[in-house]
């Protein structure tokens, strides 16, 4: 039975040209995290494999930095980066858990972080 929950940074906003850290955390399970995939809609941004390290999709290599931890840093933000991001945790023996983050990239300098929330 899958008992874990994914905690994410929730709905977040950031300034155009700035950077943002996409972060998820898996809790309430003893399952081993083998890999985390980061996706935007149907596009892979990066993979962090516990043993093999990081894969960064070539189309994002100049704007995505691995970490901190299993998270992902998105740099040089544009308004086109607005949208849904997913962290997909591959675990053993539970299987996969998915968390969702919505990022809004703002033209103005007023960009606030939303509250943290959980997805079961």
């Amino acid at each position: 039975m899958m008992t874990g929950t994914i905690e994410t940074t929730g709905n977040i906003s950031a300034e155009k040209g700035g950077s943002i850290i996409l972060q998820c955390h898996l809790s309430s399970t003893t399952a081993q995290v083998t890999q985390v995939n980061w996706e935007q809609q149907d596009q892979l941004l990066a993979i962090c494999n516990a043993d093999l390290g990081w894969h960064i999709s070539p189309s994002f290599k100049d704007r995505v930095a691995p970490g901190p931890g299993l998270g992902l840093t998105l740099q040089s933000l544009t308004v086109n980066d607005t949208g849904e991001y997913f962290c997909i945790y591959h675990t053993y023996p539970d299987g996969t858990y998915t968390g969702r983050i919505f990022l809004e990239v703002l033209e103005s300098s007023v960009a606030e972080h939303g509250a943290r929330f959980q997805i079961p």
Epitope: Q35, I47, L52, G53, H55, S57, K61
Partner: antibody, heavy 119, light 107 residues
Framework: EVQLVQSGAEVKKPGSSVKVSCKAS????????IHWVRQAPGQGLEWIGG????????IYNQIFRGRVTITADKSTSTAYMELSSLRSEDTAVYFC????????????WGQGTTVTVSS | DIQMTQSPSSLSASVGDRVTITCKAS??????VVWYQQKPGKAPKLLIY???YRFTGVPSRFSGSGSGTDFTLTISSLQPEDFATYYC?????????FGGGTKVEIK
């Protein structure tokens, strides 16, 4: 020039073990993951597992059920793949490969080592 | 494990032909797909990754596309040196898995 040079062909008895070596040159050994892939005669490619020399992380294809061990000697930039409890179905060409930096794509390959398992 | 199914398993074509090879994943793999070329008695060579970027030195006649579960390798104008077997591979999740291969033969 990146090169992966593998050890020579082996003939083994069923139940025994084989250890294939792969000497890397032309790049910094600790900066790239080494993978092992095999190909049975006339068949396709099968991923065996990988070794990350940066932090000694090792991952295996569970189809080999603990029969495979991948190690490395960083001082000589050499990776090793040992397969135990050999059976005739393990007869194949074994390739070591290097993964590109920050890419899960195998960009350079060794020449292959033929392992024949026969009684 | 994710299954990668290639089609056709073999094809006959002439120099100058446009050749298309498809690869279908048994589940979503986003764009985590790589293509290799292998000639008899030789090690595979990296052609295309992610899944539309050509590796260093790969001619522009080779192109890749696709996302999700369906992927395509296209050779726009087949050359004599392109007669080989082509494999797709996914790295979306371990174990990494390959397609069964497509052998491109001379007609």
């Amino acid at each position: 020039e990146v090169q992966l040079v593998q050890s020579g062909a082996e003939v083994k008895k069923p139940g025994s073990s084989v250890k294939v070596s792969c000497k890397a040159s032309g790049y910094t050994f600790t900066e790239h993951v080494i993978h092992w892939v095999r190909q049975a005669p006339g068949q396709g490619l099968e991923w065996i597992g990988g070794f990350n020399p940066n932090h000694d992380g090792t991952i295996y294809n569970q189809i080999f059920r603990g029969r495979v061990t991948i190690t490395a000697d960083k001082s000589t930039s050499t990776a090793y793949m040992e397969l135990s409890s050999l059976r005739s179905e393990d007869t194949a060409v074994y390739f070591c490969t290097r993964a590109a930096k920050l890419l899960f794509a195998m960009d350079y390959w060794g020449q292959g080592t033929t392992v024949t398992v026969s009684s | 494990d994710i299954q990668m199914t290639q089609s056709p398993s073999s094809l006959s074509a002439s120099v100058g032909d446009r050749v298309t090879i498809t690869c279908k994943a048994s589940q979503h793999v986003s764009n985590a797909v790589v293509w290799y070329q292998q000639k008899p008695g030789k090690a595979p060579k990296l052609l295309i990754y992610s899944p539309s970027y050509r590796f260093t030195g790969v001619p522009s006649r080779f192109s890749g596309s696709g996302s999700g579960t369906d992927f395509t390798l296209t050779i726009s104008s087949l050359q004599p040196e392109d007669f080989a077997t082509y494999y797709c591979q996914q790295h979306y999740s371990t174990p990494w898995t390959f397609g069964g291969g497509t052998k491109v033969e001379i007609k």
